[in-house]
């Protein structure tokens, strides 16, 4: 599963340019006076994506984000000056960075921002119905944002607004030291975690908050916070980070004497995401970056997807781990972590645990405790001194479902879509990175549905410049993905079946659960459609089984074979470029001598060097002339991509061309020129670097001389010039548009 083989590379890799050209990305490149498009709120009902940014809140149309409304919500000049005088950066810190954006009720949103290190909140009217088209700030009513938004824009807030109450994990002070989980708004007194107690929270960084029911009784509902924090001394030797899941009961109103206006049901457990390493030492991915909850039929048991990175600066890696809520609950019902003093190791608590068990929500379900204020002193005391569980939560199958350690990027965000395919449901992950790319990954069962293998379908660059993806939302209704970064917002479809190709096999090889071969094209798969007409194989991506009745080999279904003629010079080198669209495909070359039917496999050696981009033929001989066939082989299916006819020009021929008197009739040049076809392409740079002819310093010199004569001939015979010039122009364009593997910095042939 972790081998960095072909399965670990994206099958398709699309640059930003390619995404734009194929209309697969829509970007909002931000406003000149804004940035930090990090806070997302998806409203499928109104078909809007609300985005909180620097001094602005946006309302984007989910169909097309180019259509948007905006609210400007800056801070006053006074506030900005106070912030500046406090030694903060006027551009990066002394502004109103929106950190909280939540649905408050049917008609309003609740928004909070840093307010230039003076957190502030207000309500935003959005109307009852989508057609109301209302989007306005309630500027007559501002509230203190302390305990809701951080002061510092660099810090995140994890928040959740339910039943008019805001749960938020954030820093509650100017210095960014007093981190807490708060409940504010509503009619009750604000509640928070215990202050100045590192056993509860130790310099945490909050990721997200989610309401998850515990039973069918809403009194048992819990709010779960995901965060990372410094490991407490004794938990780990040296400074380390731990990923955490924390729980609190929705109906926690604090204690009656101890923990007054503090959570009495707060518990936390470590989330493990690691792989076994050499010497029995596990490699841990501890820096939790993002969490996504995939809802199941049972609302009590969503699947938790977590994105993690390594803490090490030397070894950079990312992983995705999946957790089940039953495992989480099992840990919260297990032993509490206990130690007798700061110099002692943490051990599982062996003593008597008070009743009701700390962390249990007061309800009719569990013993009739009406409120946390009714809990006996021993429960509160125990809860105060034992906020952490001893056992960690291990991922499903005890290992990550995906890791990446061999790349120059790290994962930052994740959203997951559950897709109905021909043979069951598949979870498709969209993973954001710190270089502005999105990975599309599908979890495919190997032998069983429990043993998953990750198939990396695509790597898409969604922003022009490399930028950290800091927010992602997925609209199942619109079948679109929305991505946020400092630079702006991007929108892309969840599926683009047509990009896979025009043949059944190509569609099948793609292994995209969204797509299937419908008999004539690769298109969106709908489970309701007639099954017999749909071809799909997500599990194995085997076209031989699923498409064999349609095509036994290749090129039968609209796949036009590209043909080219290339001229090489004897004793020099030439490059035959061929790179399949799929990075998973293996390239297989065959050679066919002139006037022969027999094809032979090309043997690589000193004379022929194989590169990722194609074949490099060194020290060309006349016998190298012939047809070169480039095939892509993937999962047993072979497709011919290209037929290159190589003509090797002998040295004598070349000498004639070079040393012929300028006034000569140029017949040889004419012969060479006229034999070229529009699909030709000469790789001049490879010639320049590798040619070694006694009378020729560079291929450029050769070309210059050919062109000089050609120009002379055109002057002498004006009627001939047009065709030749167009011929070369076509070649130039065909080079530009050929495919992503062609290095953009390589010089194309100059027009003749």
């Amino acid at each position: 599963n972790y081998a960095n083989g072909k399965n670990n590379v994206p099958r398709l890799k699309l640059s930003y340019k390619e995404m734009l050209e194929s209309n697969n990305v829509i970007t909002f490149n931000g406003l000149a006076n804004s940035s930090s498009y990090h806070t997302f709120l998806l409203d499928e009902e109104r078909s809007r994506l609300y985005v909180g940014a620097k001094d602005h809140i946006f309302s984007f149309n989910l169909v097309n984000i180019k259509d948007f409304q905006k609210i400007v919500w800056p801070v006053s000049y006074t506030r900005r000056d106070e912030c500046k005088w406090a030694g903060k950066d006027i551009l990066k810190e002394c502004a109103n960075f929106i950190k909280v954006l939540k649905a408050y009720n049917q008609t309003h949103l609740y928004a909070c921002g840093t307010g230039a290190f003076h957190p502030i909140c207000t309500y935003i009217e959005v109307g009852h119905h989508p057609e109301d088209n209302i989007f306005k700030l309630q500027d007559s009513h501002f509230e203190n944002g302390r305990g809701k938004s951080p002061y510092d824009p660099k810090l995140l807030t994890a928040s959740l607004l339910i039943d008019g109450e805001l749960y938020s994990g954030t820093a509650a002070d100017f210095m960014g030291r007093d981190f807490a989980i708060f409940r504010t708004l509503g009619h009750h007194h604000p509640i928070r975690t215990e202050q100045h107690d590192s056993r509860w929270l130790n310099d945490p960084r909050f990721i997200s908050a989610h309401l998850i029911p515990e039973s069918d009784n809403p009194e048992d509902d819990k709010v779960y916070f995901f965060f990372r924090e410094n490991a407490i001394d004794g938990e780990h030797s040296g400074k380390a980070t731990h990923a955490r899941i924390g729980q609190i009961c929705k109906n926690d109103f604090g204690g009656h004497r101890s923990l007054v206006n503090k959570w009495t049901t707060f518990l936390k457990a470590r989330l493990i995401c690691s792989v076994p390493g050499p010497n029995g030492i596990d490699t841990h991915f501890d820096e939790l970056q993002d969490v996504f909850l995939m809802n199941s039929k049972d609302p009590k048991n969503p699947i938790v997807y977590g994105v993690f990175t390594t803490s090490s600066n030397i070894f950079k890696g990312s992983a995705v781990c999946m957790y089940s809520m039953s495992d989480v609950r099992r840990v919260f019902l297990g032993p509490y972590a206990h130690r007798d003093g700061p110099n002692y190791q943490w051990v599982p608590y062996q003593g008597r645990v008070p009743y009701p068990r700390p962390g249990t929500c007061p309800s009719k379900t569990f013993g009739g405790f009406d409120s946390t204020k009714d809990l006996p002193d021993d429960v509160i005391t125990f809860a105060r001194s034992h906020p952490a569980m001893y056992n960690p939560v291990f991922p499903i199958n005890n290992r990550p479902i995906m890791i990446k350690t061999d790349v120059n990027y790290q994962f930052t965000q994740i959203v997951v879509d559950r897709v109905d395919a021909e043979d069951g449901q598949y979870d498709v992950m969209f993973i954001g990175t710190d270089v502005g790319t999105v990975l599309k990954v599908v979890s495919v069962p190997k032998e069983t549905w429990h043993d998953l293998e990750e198939v990396l379908l695509e790597e898409m660059t969604v922003f022009r410049e490399p930028t950290t993806i800091s927010a992602m939302e997925l609209s199942t209704k619109q079948q679109q993905l929305y991505i946020g970064s400092t630079a702006g917002v991007a929108q892309l479809p969840l599926h683009r079946c047509d990009i896979y190709g025009k043949a059944c096999a190509e569609c099948c090889l793609a292994r995209d659960p969204y797509c299937a071969w419908d008999g004539s094209s690769c298109s969106r798969y709908f489970p309701t459609a007639k099954r017999r007409t749909r071809r799909q194989d997500i599990r194995n991506g085997d076209p031989l089984t699923h498409c064999s009745d349609l095509q036994h080999h290749d090129n039968h279904h609209g796949h036009s074979l590209e043909e080219r003629i290339i001229y090489g010079v004897e004793n020099s080198s030439t490059f035959l470029e061929c790179s399949p669209k799929s990075q998973r495909a293996l390239v297989y070359w065959q050679f066919q001598r002139r006037n022969e039917d027999r094809k032979e496999e090309i043997r690589v050696g000193d004379h022929i060097i194989r590169t990722e981009q194609g074949l490099l033929l060194r020290s060309l001989q006349k016998k190298d002339s012939g047809n070169y066939l480039c095939h892509a082989v993937e999962h047993g299916f072979m497709q011919t991509l290209l037929k290159v006819t190589l003509e090797v020009i002998d040295t004598e021929h070349l000498e004639e061309l070079l040393h012929k008197d300028d006034d000569g009739d140029g017949s040889k040049t004419k012969e060479m020129s006229s034999s070229m076809t529009p699909s030709q392409k000469v790789w001049y740079r490879d010639f320049m670097q590798l040619i070694n002819h006694p009378n020729l310093n560079t291929m450029d010199e050769f070309c210059e001389q050919v062109w000089k004569r050609d120009r002379k001939q055109r002057r002498q015979r004006p009627g001939h010039s047009q065709g030749s010039s167009n011929k070369w122009k076509h070649m130039q364009e065909s080079k530009k548009g050929r495919n992503r593997r062609t290095h953009e910095f390589e010089r194309a042939p100059r027009s003749v």
Partner: antibody
């Protein structure tokens, strides 16, 4: 004024049963934990049982567990202690007490239970 | 269970004198300790809650201190009505337990 009045004490044979009652007044009964504490003749105090506000859960020491049952009727402002399988060592004055979540702030005058053959 | 040990078992003092009663817990109980006074033929009465919190209606001469395992009840100037038995009780964890009592008698 807070008042707690116990009743139901008396003489009972070993193995027998008895039900004590405590009528509460002067405070919102359903807002407090309630407890029973006993004192054997010439001895110290011993906690017997505590019931939470709703009546949904109760606590007991090992010495009376499975033999004594505390209950309450919030609509009648009354606390009960059902005692069965009584032993000679259960002979004591039984006090009805307000509290048990924290300190026990109000005590009744007590009712005497004598277990003897 | 948590065992509370009171000392001395009996304390003989004269009115006007200062009384210092001790209660020691077998394990740390924070400040979850309460003091009661019981006179012959009467029910106990709460004097101090949570180690040091005074109770309304209780004279100011009664005060409590301590936390963890060692606690003290102090009566600054004894009055004739103060001669009684004093009990400490822990509310830290079930089962709740009482100390054996200290009998304060007139010398």
């Amino acid at each position: 004024e807070v008042q707690l009045v116990e009743s139901g004490g008396g003489l009972v044979q070993p193995g027998g049963s008895l039900r004590l009652s405590c009528a509460a007044s002067g405070f919102t009964f359903s807002s407090y934990y309630m407890s029973w504490v006993r004192q054997a003749p010439g001895k110290g105090l011993e906690w017997v049982s505590t019931i939470i506000k709703s009546g949904g859960y109760a606590y007991y020491p090992d010495s009376v567990k499975d033999r004594f049952t505390i209950s309450r009727d919030n609509s009648k402002n009354t606390l009960y202690l059902q005692m069965s399988s009584l032993r000679a060592e259960d002979t004591a004055v039984y006090y009805c007490v307000r509290g048990g979540q924290g300190a026990m702030d109000y005590w009744g005058q007590g009712t005497t239970v004598t277990v003897s053959s | 269970e948590i065992v509370l040990t009171q000392s001395p078992a009996t304390l003989s003092l004269s009115p006007g004198e200062r009384a210092t009663l001790s209660c020691r817990a077998s394990q740390s109980i924070g400040d979850y300790l309460h003091w009661y006074q019981q006179k012959p033929g009467q029910a106990p009465r709460l004097l101090i809650k949570y180690a040091s919190q005074s109770i309304s209606g209780i004279p100011a001469r009664f005060s409590g201190s301590g936390s963890g395992t060692d606690f003290t009840l102090t009566i600054t100037s004894l009055e004739p009505e103060d001669f009684a038995v004093y009990y400490c009780q822990q509310g830290y964890s079930f089962p709740y337990t009482f100390g054996g009592g200290t009998k304060l008698e007139i010398k």
